[in-house]
């Protein structure tokens, strides 16, 4: 159940895909990854106001209970709904290898 | 990849399963659910310090970038890793029906 995509907080303030440029040093990968030297990391950032992109029934419950007691139950959180694969060229004992990671780059976001 | 389960913030402070008691009224379900009158909602609450229960590579990246740019990249968030099903007895036009919801109660938690 993918609920409303209208952000009541204003354009770009709610849960959505963002791109953050990061070097191998930023990621702590310099010692085991050869390429790419820089990664365009796609991640899910933004607020999850009431029923915005609610992933499922659990998210809807969380919204209801957060409204009742914000200090007890946190608001839903903006997280990946799916991922894009990414290939890294890694250093190995014998040279290099290509490794595909399926859970590295967010493709789509929702609130849960 | 399920990283460390040791919480550096102290017992019970990090991402874990909590139970919150909620009535149908609390959940806004009183008009369409007959039973149960009260739900023991299991949900994931708590902090996600560095590499604690990191769900995948994306969570590890998020941790690294949050440390570098806390204003830009949020810390990983405590969300359900899996769910337990729950049966609700619902009101219908003709009487009642039993409906199983697979995404209502959190079973296990991780950080993403």
């Amino acid at each position: 159940a993918r609920n409303g995509d209208h952000c009541p907080l204003g354009p770009g303030r709610c849960c959505r895909l963002h791109t953050v440029r990061a070097s191998l040093e930023d990621l702590g990968w310099a010692d085991w990854v050869l390429s790419p030297r820089e990664v365009q990391v796609t991640m899910c950032i933004g607020a999850c106001p009431s029923q915005f992109r609610a992933a499922n029934m659990h998210a809807q419950i969380k919204t209801s209970l957060h409204r009742l007691k914000p200090d007890t139950v946190p608001a839903p959180c903006c997280v990946p709904a799916s991922y894009n694969p990414m290939v890294l060229i890694q250093k190995t004992d014998t040279g290099v290898s290509l490794q595909t990671y399926d859970d590295l780059l967010a493709k789509d976001c929702h609130c849960i | 990849a399920r990283n460390g389960d040791h919480c550096p913030l102290g017992p019970g402070r990090c991402c874990r399963l909590h139970t919150v008691r909620a009535s149908l009224e609390d959940l806004g379900w009183a008009d369409w659910v007959l039973s149960p009158r009260e739900v023991q909602v299991t949900m994931c609450i708590g902090a996600c310090p560095s590499q604690f229960r990191a769900a995948n590579m994306h969570a590890q990246i998020k941790t690294s970038l949050h440390r570098l740019k806390p204003d830009t990249v949020p810390a990983p968030c405590c969300v359900p890793a899996s769910y337990n099903p729950m049966v609700l007895i619902q009101k219908t036009d003709t009487g009642v029906s039993l409906q199983t919801y697979d995404d209502l109660l959190a079973k296990d938690c991780h950080c993403i």
Epitope: P8, S50, L68, K69, P70, A75 | D26, P74
Partner: antibody, heavy 118, light 107 residues
Framework: QITLKESGPTLVKPTQTLTLTCTFS??????????VSWIRQPPGKGLEWLAH???????RYNPTLKSRLTITKDPSKNQVVLTMTNMDPVDTATYYC??????????WGQGTLVTVSS | DIVLTQSPSFLSASVGDRVTITCKAS??????VAWFQQKPGKSPKALIY???YRYSGVPDRFTGSGSGTEFTLTISSLQPEDFAAYFC?????????FGGGTKLEIK
């Protein structure tokens, strides 16, 4: 129409206990999402939240004052009572009660000025 | 405790002006922020809840925005009755905390 009104002594002596009553109408404190908070404001100063009681009798207190505060409710009388022990001249303030609906304090009483002096 | 830093503390403006008051939280409070107006000798009046929602009866010249740690209250065209003190408040965590207030005065 939602209204709240604070009542209690206007003058208390140091070390005494203050008891304030908030009498409200227009809503039920038995309804999910409802609560009542107490807030105070020393003359010419800002607002300080003191205590909160939820519809389900769950209570919260300001940690700096927790040992001195007690909040209770009587939904049948539409009242919330705050007691504050060991009063001191620095506790001189206008004390407000406010309705909380889903966390947000939407209706406030007119306030009652409490002076602590010997 | 979450500290709300409100700025400016004092603001002089004229009728018809557009003014903005900011409120910064020491940690993420989501959208659980309210704004209040208080006139001398009166109790606070609720203007905005959930960071951006106006209460019924509040003129649409009052606009709230923000989420996380940065929030603003904007009055688009000041009216004589708007000169008062304004407070932000967070209700995401106990203890609930208020900003120090902004006193809006006629220039």
């Amino acid at each position: 129409q939602i209204t709240l009104k604070e009542s209690g002594p206007t003058l208390v002596k140091p070390t005494q206990t203050l008891t304030l009553t908030c009498t409200f109408s227009g809503f039920s404190l038995s309804t999910s999402g409802m609560g009542v908070s107490w807030i105070r404001q020393p003359p010419g100063k800002g607002l300080e939240w003191l205590a909160h009681i939820y519809w389900d009798d769950d209570k919260r207190y300001n940690p700096t004052l927790k040992s001195r505060l007690t909040i209770t409710k009587d939904p049948s009388k539409n009242q919330v009572v705050l007691t504050m022990t060991n009063m001191d001249p620095v506790d001189t303030a206008t004390y407000y009660c406010a309705r909380s609906s889903y966390g947000a304090m939407d209706y406030w009483g007119q306030g009652t000025l409490v002076t602590v002096s010997s | 405790d979450i500290v709300l830093t409100q700025s400016p503390s004092f603001l002089s403006a004229s009728v018809g002006d557009r003014v903005t008051i900011t409120c910064k939280a020491s940690q993420n409070v989501g959208t659980n922020v309210a704004w209040f107006q208080q006139k001398p000798g009166k109790s606070p009046k609720a203007l905005i809840y959930s960071a951006s929602y106006r209460y019924s009866g509040v003129p649409d010249r009052f606009t709230g925005s923000g989420s996380g740690t940065e929030f603003t209250l904007t009055i688009s065209s000041l009216q004589p009755e708007d000169f008062a003190a304004y407070f932000c408040q967070q209700y995401n965590n106990f203890p609930y905390t208020f900003g120090g207030g902004t006193k809006l005065e006629i220039k």
